[in-house]
């Protein structure tokens, strides 16, 4: 039994570390491998992770971190039963996905406006907290060329725009993402999209 | 009040063995890390070793590994250091401390809030 | 493995302002304790976490830390301040003391 794909891993930067590699052959990764990873840190326990499948010969572990700060190292060591197939070590601030935001809603009661707002997917202590910017995803369920990105390069999780720069009496949906530039993050996953019928009074035309 | 009293120094020649004991009180000791630092006489602060609220885990400075074991007795409030192969070098004040692991500005912090009034060791033929 | 240096002793005036200096690679990326030890007594905890104070440590003690030094100032020191001062960081699986620094208060 042999690694093919060495992990590689990506952090929340707040409570999990996802580590994918593939194997030489068909595994089951659950009953036949480990993962053990420990922060090099003092006092810092060994905590053993349990990998699933991810295809035929992928394995995917969830590691689980009580906190993560920037210059947090974890050393990783993959096990079949009494043997060490890979020892490696992990940062999780060089390599972090946020997380998706949540929540977003579309209000259409602002006059002529669409505010569109969603929660910060991370807690007020946590260090991205401040420094996530997100993109904006609206596109039309009917004309599949009516697509758009609004990055929102503020600290504000909501972006207002004017009704009017959409087509009126049809459905779109929009959907957020987010990135903090400071660590040189991947983007997150889309948040779920929302759905809204788009009307708004078309400007008097005087002859 | 919190209070961290040491027991068990004495003179041992080299080569000898001793065991101190930290009697500890006025704070829940099982939810705490614990560690020893000496102090050689005319000298600094030595850290010695350091052991995790539940025991599962120790760190050992690199003087005295191989040499020393940290324990604790959580159900008697009480932590441990077995000093074995004593060398004239070890003779020092050994002090029980409290320590605190914690994040404050996205660095990781371990330090000292606690300390015991220390016992003496003294290795000497 | 990491080192710690501080100069052995510093004098003040009193009432005057006293720093003591705590130089090691890049401290500036650890969090930095400082500690006050008077003779034939335990260490007390002065500061933690680079610049915080623990309860019932007079405000005259502060902290700083960047680069390659940390920095305990004394400031209006008084005659009780006279004492030995450690400053301390963990590095991997090791806490780490400076050698200390005499703080003489004429």
């Known amino acids: 039994m042999k690694v093919l794909q060495e992990p590689t891993c990506v952090s929340d930067y707040m409570s999990i570390s996802t580590c994918e590699w593939k194997m030489n052959g068909p595994t089951n990764c659950s009953t036949e491998l480990r993962l053990l990873y420990q922060l090099v840190f003092l006092l810092s326990e060994a905590h053993t992770c349990i990998p699933e499948n991810n295809g035929g010969a992928g394995c995917v572990c969830h590691l689980l971190m009580d906190d993560v700060v920037s210059a947090d190292n974890y050393t990783l060591d993959l096990w079949a039963g009494q043997q060490l197939l890979w020892k490696g070590s992990f940062k999780p601030s060089e390599h972090v996905k946020p997380r998706a935001p949540g929540n977003l809603t579309v209000h259409t009661n602002v006059s002529d406006t669409l505010l569109l707002t969603w929660s910060n997917p991370y807690p007020p202590d946590n260090y991205l907290y401040n420094h996530l910017t997100y993109a904006v995803n609206i596109w039309s369920e009917n004309d599949p060329a009516d697509f758009r990105i609004y990055n929102v390069t503020y600290l504000e999780p909501s972006l207002r725009i004017a009704a009017s720069t959409l087509k009126s009496g049809i459905s779109y949906r929009a959907r957020v993402r987010a990135w903090a530039q400071c660590y040189n993050t991947t983007w997150s996953e889309w948040s779920p999209s929302t759905k809204w019928h788009n009307s708004y009074r078309e400007p008097f035309e005087q002859h | 009040q919190l209070q961290l009293v040491e027991s068990g120094g004495g003179l041992v020649q080299p080569g000898g063995s001793l065991r101190l004991s930290c009697a500890a009180s006025?704070?829940?000791?099982?939810?705490?890390?614990m560690t020893w630092v000496r102090q050689a006489p005319g000298k600094g602060l030595e850290w010695v070793s350091a052991?995790?609220?539940?025991?599962?885990?120790?760190n050992y400075a690199d003087s005295v590994k191989g040499r020393v074991t940290i324990s604790r007795d959580n159900a008697k409030n009480t932590l441990y250091l077995q000093m074995n192969s004593l060398k004239p070098e070890d003779t020092a004040v050994y002090f029980c401390?409290?320590?605190?692991?914690?994040?404050?500005?996205?660095?990781?912090?371990?330090?000292?809030?606690?300390w015991g009034q220390g016992t003496q060791v003294t290795v000497s033929s | 493995s990491y080192e710690l240096t501080q100069s052995p002793s510093v004098s003040v005036a009193l009432r005057q302002t006293a720093k003591i200096t705590c130089g090691g690679n890049n401290i500036g990326s650890k969090s930095a304790q400082w500690y006050q030890q008077k003779p034939g007594q335990a260490p007390v905890l002065v500061i933690y976490a680079d610049s915080r104070r623990p309860s019932g440590i007079p405000e005259r003690f502060s902290g700083s830390n960047s680069g390659n030094t940390a920095t305990l100032t004394v400031s209006g020191a008084q005659a009780e301040d006279e004492a030995d001062y450690y400053c301390q960081v963990w590095d991997t699986s090791a806490v780490v003391f400076g050698g200390g620094t005499r703080l003489t208060v004429l």
């Open positions: 052991i995790n609220s539940g025991g599962g885990s120790t």
């Open positions: 006025g704070f829940t000791f099982s939810s705490y890390d």
């Open positions: 401390a409290r320590a605190l692991r914690t994040v404050v500005h996205d660095r990781r912090l371990f330090y000292i809030d606690s």
